[in-house]
Amino acid sequence: QAGPLPKPTLWAEPGSVISWGNSVTIWCQGTLEAREYRLDKEESPAPWDRQNPLEPKNKARFSIPSMTEDYAGRYRCYYRSPVGWSQPSDPLELVMTGAYSKPTLSALPSPLVTSGKSVTLLCQSRSPMDTFLLIKERAAHPLLHLRSEHGAQQHQAEFPMSPVTSVHGGTYRCFSSHGFSHYLLSHPSDPLELIVSGSLEDPRPSPTRSVSTAAGPEDQPLMPTGSVPHSGLRRHWE
């Protein structure tokens, strides 16, 4: 008896992080024996879409002409051959940016920092959020991912770095998001250039505990006062 059909490969072009309104194509690649391809979206009625294979039948294209909130989510695909349906592909997480206004990113006490000292990157959002992402340019994955432990929404998250080394230098951006869909992100913040001077070298920086604060009355301009209790955000390394 033949074993299960190999699972197909699922990917998105130009990528899996898409700005609102931009087009994206989802590809599902199976085998030459495929007769039909099916794309399922988590928490949507299955199948989300069906497509006939493109010649030479080993893949199918699912087109999204204009990215909106409805398309963001987790996808899997399958193909059907004469002997039945394949295993599901590994999931594809399609993320939309531009769901919310851009946060602002600051370096405290300054974006010019001496090696061995401490710096905190502060990401502040216009509306209360419960997830903050810090991205370093040319890094493969989000550097830091802070999520509220109790779903308490906050206007900011702090990303402390200590001790700072040359490894920390570079361009950073941050995003904010709501926990009800971590597939929907804000516009990226304006870039922040962190410049590290000095010669102390430590190739393995160890960030300290992350802190998130509720909006304060005097020193949080235009943040509603007493809006959320201190709950802290949980740090996730990714």
Epitope: G21, E69, M96, Y100, L108, P109, L222
Partner: antibody
């Protein structure tokens, strides 16, 4: 392309109400605050208030509280501002504007409201 | 409420020359939480809505020519147009977004000399 398209000019009698609309397109409507700003003829800009389309949250300048009411229709990506008990000083161009981080990155073309007996 | 006061009320500058507009706030717009100044500048041409030029006191909005520059901190801010062009004729407004209600300066009318 982000666009905020406002309804046309209105002429109203003192004591009447006016409802101005602002239809948004080209961005994720529910995730951005929309504010309203007043500009009397030949004068400066005055902030009226905001609405957050995601949940309908509003905040008003004390000066307009009780007379300005902002609402949202998510199905048409439209925000409305109603101004009641109109008086001659309400004659102005009213702008809707999209908030970035409390400042405004996109503005509607403006709606002229004339209050005259 | 924070009061924003611009000076001068009007200004005439020759083409190619530098134009400087000042804005003073009745209280500091510098946040100690993020070391940013909560101030924006807008340009408004006749019959048009305002257009964002500068935010965070000195960050130029995308697409705005680099002859426009914002500076200052705390309560005193400046918008500088390094080399005036004919299309820069407009009224310029500063706006504080440190606290509600949001408030604007009274405007500075910039003309060609």
């Amino acid at each position: 392309e982000v666009q905020l398209v406002q309804s046309g000019a209105e002429v109203k009698k003192p004591g009447a109400s006016v409802k101005v609309s602002c239809k948004a397109s080209g961005y994720s409507f529910t995730g951005f605050y929309i504010d309203w700003v007043k500009q009397p003829p030949g004068k400066g800009l005055e902030w009226i208030g905001y609405i957050f389309p995601s949940n309908g949250e509003t905040s008003y300048n004390q000066k307009f509280k009780g007379r300005a009411t902002m609402t949202v229709d998510k199905s048409t990506s439209t925000v409305y501002m109603e101004l009641s008990s109109l008086r001659s000083e309400d004659t102005a161009v009213y702008y809707c504007a999209r908030q970035a981080f409390y400042y405004f990155d996109y503005w509607g073309q403006g709606t002229t409201v004339t209050v005259s007996s | 409420d924070i009061v924003m006061t611009q000076s001068p009320d009007s200004l005439a500058v020759s083409l190619g020359e530098r134009a400087t507009i000042n804005c003073k706030s009745s209280q500091s717009l510098l946040s100690s939480s993020n070391q940013k100044n909560y101030l924006a500048w807008y340009q408004q041409k006749p019959g048009q809505p305002p257009k964002l030029l500068i935010y965070w006191a000195s960050t130029r909005e995308s697409g705005v020519p680099d002859r426009f520059a914002g500076s200052g901190s705390g309560t005193d801010f400046t918008l500088t147009i390094s080399s005036l062009q004919a299309e820069d004729v407009a009224v310029y407004y500063c706006q504080q977004y440190y606290s509600y209600p949001l408030t604007f300066g009274q405007g500075t009318k910039l003309e060609i000399k």
